[in-house]
């Protein structure tokens, strides 16, 4: 049998096989050693007994999407049946005091591979034996502690395979420079040691994506905005936009990145080299936000210039093909690629990423201030508590509720919270009365809210003993 017979039903075309050469991977036309690595079809009854105590599940993840040319990393994690784990020696043991269907096990080992390998290696002194090989016959790499690695992982994609010896978790990185754009399938088959042979224990597949567009995400934050995830923000307050570029392999680390913003509110094009930008909308309504991210990334070189005619002088080796960004009104991302040819084939290509959002701008409470605090004299002497009136002003829309949170002087330990609806006039001037139990210093957080906004002000106040002569003090605001 060949690798492709064993590993995959997806058969890439000859073109795909030729143009998607992965560095360090081998062609799936190679022969598979079925004696050492038996092949079971899906539904084969032998799967039931491939692992003591149940089935092993393999979980395959990747940090896809990957910008073409960058590295994509695949991780496989094995999930063992309940109460089983891998120990420091790579053996599979029962967890202490863990009860599964079979109850507590007397034998601490599910698989004691250390003992097996000592018993059955029959090696030739080099540490190498005929069964310490991968399915294609290549010997296991002998780095320190390799004996504790008892799982064999075979990765398969784009008509090629990669073999790896590992523990219950492995990672493989692939450079995507030669990978066709779009979704691709990665399949992994996992075997475990079984004496002098191997037994399949799990198969898993996952789709990954290679793209020529920079994967871009934007987070938006605004002070006083009640719900930051609904893309509704407040007029006349800055919104902070933070651009996150998905680049887990740091492919763009040395690239100059430009962020070209169109906020959709007649502010034209705003270009920045900073991934964060603040923008204030001064109108209510719905606006279309567009971001184009541009990065000069390592990329393919253009074809070499045609050989010169004999009568002409030889052109310089360093030829530059450049086309400049267009700023004409038009769809974002219609800029031609920029290529530069330099002698060592170390060329750059402009890559673009795009983000679009529709954001809604509404009126909101922009600011709240405590302008006065008054100790209210109570008709009945009340030795333990003080009534205090806070006179509060606000800017922006009219609040519908007020909350006060009274806490210790560090503002960390809440003592009580009171919220109540308010009816405020256009001037936005209101009085909030609150009770303080006993003298001392208190932190007061006062918030005014409506449907879309929540504005906060804080102050430290000193409540004196119930001596009419002692004044109320605002410690600081």
């Amino acid at each position: 049998k060949r690798f492709h017979d064993v590993l995959g039903n997806e058969r890439p075309s000859a073109y795909m096989r030729e143009h998607n050469q992965l560095n360090g991977w081998s062609s799936d036309e190679n022969d598979w050693n079925e004696k050492l690595y038996p092949v079971w079809k899906r539904g084969d009854m032998r799967w039931k007994n491939s692992w003591k105590g149940g089935r092993v599940q393999a979980v395959l993840t990747s940090d896809s999407p990957a910008l073409v040319g960058s590295n994509i990393t695949f991780a496989v994690n094995l999930i063992f049946p309940r109460c089983q784990k891998e120990d420091a020696n790579g053996n599979i043991v029962y967890e202490k005091n863990c009860r599964n269907e079979a109850g507590l096990s007397a034998d601490p080992y599910v698989y004691n591979w250390t003992a097996w390998s000592e018993d059955s290696d029959g090696e030739n002194g080099t540490g190498q034996s005929h069964h310490n090989v991968f399915p294609d016959g290549k010997p296991f790499p002998h780095h320190p502690g390799w004996r504790r690695w008892n799982f064999i992982y075979v990765f398969h994609t784009l008509g090629q395979y990669f073999q790896k010896l590992g523990r219950c978790s492995v990672r493989v990185s692939v450079n995507t420079a030669n990978v066709t754009l779009g979704p691709q399938l990665m399949e992994v088959t996992v075997y475990r040691r079984h004496g002098r042979a191997y037994v399949p224990i799990a198969q898993v597949k996952d789709v990954y994506v290679v793209t020529d567009q920079i994967p871009v995400f934007v987070t938006m934050f605004q002070k006083n905005d009640r719900n930051s995830s609904d893309e509704t923000f407040l007029k006349d307050l800055p919104i902070m936009f933070d651009v996150l570029i998905h680049d887990p392999s740091h492919f763009l680390n040395y690239s100059t990145i430009n962020y070209k913003w169109s906020f959709g509110d007649n502010t034209g094009l705003f270009v920045s080299t900073n991934h964060t930008v603040n923008h204030t909308y001064v109108l209510n309504g719905t606006f279309s936000l567009n971001l184009t991210v541009k990065a000069a990334a390592p990329g393919p070189c253009p074809p070499p210039p045609p050989p010169p005619r004999p009568s002409k002088p030889t052109p310089s080796l360093a030829t530059t093909l450049k086309s400049y960004d267009s700023n004409t009104p038009g769809p974002a991302g219609d800029n031609p690629l920029e290529l530069s040819r330099i002698p060592d084939e170390n060329c750059q290509i402009n890559r673009y990423g795009h983000f679009q959002a529709t954001i809604t701008i509404v009126e909101g409470i922009l600011e709240v201030n405590i302008i006065q605090m008054t100790d209210v004299l109570m008709p009945v002497p009340w030795p333990e508590s003080s009534l205090i009136d806070f006179v509060v002003t606000c800017q922006g829309s009219i609040p519908t509720e007020v909350c006060t949170i009274i806490s210790d002087p560090t503002c960390e330990i809440t003592q009580n919270t009171v919220c109540s609806p308010v009816d405020v006039d256009e001037m936005c001037l209101l009085t909030v009365r609150r009770t303080f139990n006993g003298s001392g210093t208190y932190c007061v957080n006062l918030t005014l809210g409506d449907d879309t906004s929540l504005a906060l002000t804080s102050t430290l106040i000193s409540v004196p003993d119930r001596d009419p002569a002692s004044p109320l003090r605002m410690a600081n605001s």
Epitope: D265, G268, V271, S272, Y281, L283, G285, T286, P329
Partner: antibody, heavy 112, light 107 residues
């Protein structure tokens, strides 16, 4: 290519109104805000206001709030500015402009 | 409203000289400043946006710099065709304002 074609020169009397137009070609009118700018002879540029033709949002320079009214007709790709209660102070060249593009200007003369 | 102030109404220069025109905003406008060129009898033309980015087709002798409240527009080697009035404009909010303009005269 993008072009903004403005209506011809206007000669009118004080107290009347005038409506000038700006026809966009080479792009979709509703994609970009249309701005209007005033320039009196020998003077600088004064921003009057702007309209988003896709939803008719408008914003004005407070100085022109009661003087100018901006409208747009997506079907004909045309933006309009109406100036009312004209005085000699309104005599000027009026430009329409979108991001990076300017019309050739409409000259308004108000004279009795 | 944001006020844009160009301190020099006129600047005199010679062909081949380097000349810089300044503009000050009454409040922080980040880098949201554009520069326009207006030649006699013509509409203005956008040269620079976002403080330092040349608009399509603008020769590279025109550059811009600055952020916050202070901005500079520079012509590295003045040509006769650069005789014009140069206006700064903020595009920080929906409501634009222009500077008063600086007229560049060729000696």
């Amino acid at each position: 290519q993008v072009q903004l074609q403005q209506s011809g020169a206007e000669l009118t009397k004080p107290g009347t109104s005038v409506k000038m137009s700006c026809k966009a070609s080479g792009y979709t009118l509703s994609s970009y805000w249309m701005n209007w700018i005033k320039q009196r002879p020998g003077q600088g540029l004064e921003w009057i206001g702007t309209i988003n033709p896709s939803n008719n949002y408008t914003a004005y320079n407070l100085k022109f709030k009661d003087k100018a009214m901006l409208t747009a007709d997506k079907s004909s790709s045309t933006a309009y500015m109406q100036l009312s209660s004209l005085t000699s102070e309104d005599s000027a060249v009026y430009y329409c402009a979108t991001w990076g593009y300017w019309g050739q200007g409409t000259t308004l003369t108000v004279s009795s | 409203d944001i006020v844009m102030t160009q301190s020099h109404k006129f600047m005199s220069t010679s062909v081949g000289d380097r000349v810089s025109i300044t503009c000050k905003a009454s409040q922080d406008v980040s880098t949201a400043v554009a520069w326009h060129q207006q030649k006699p009898g013509q509409p203005p033309k956008l040269l620079i946006y976002s403080a330092s980015y040349r608009y399509t087709g603008v020769p590279d002798r025109f550059t811009g710099s600055g952020s916050g409240t202070d901005f500079t527009f520079t012509i590295s080697s003045v040509q006769t065709e650069d005789l014009a009035i140069y206006y700064c404009q903020h595009h920080y909010t929906t409501t634009w304002t222009f500077g008063g303009g600086t007229k560049l005269e060729i000696r």
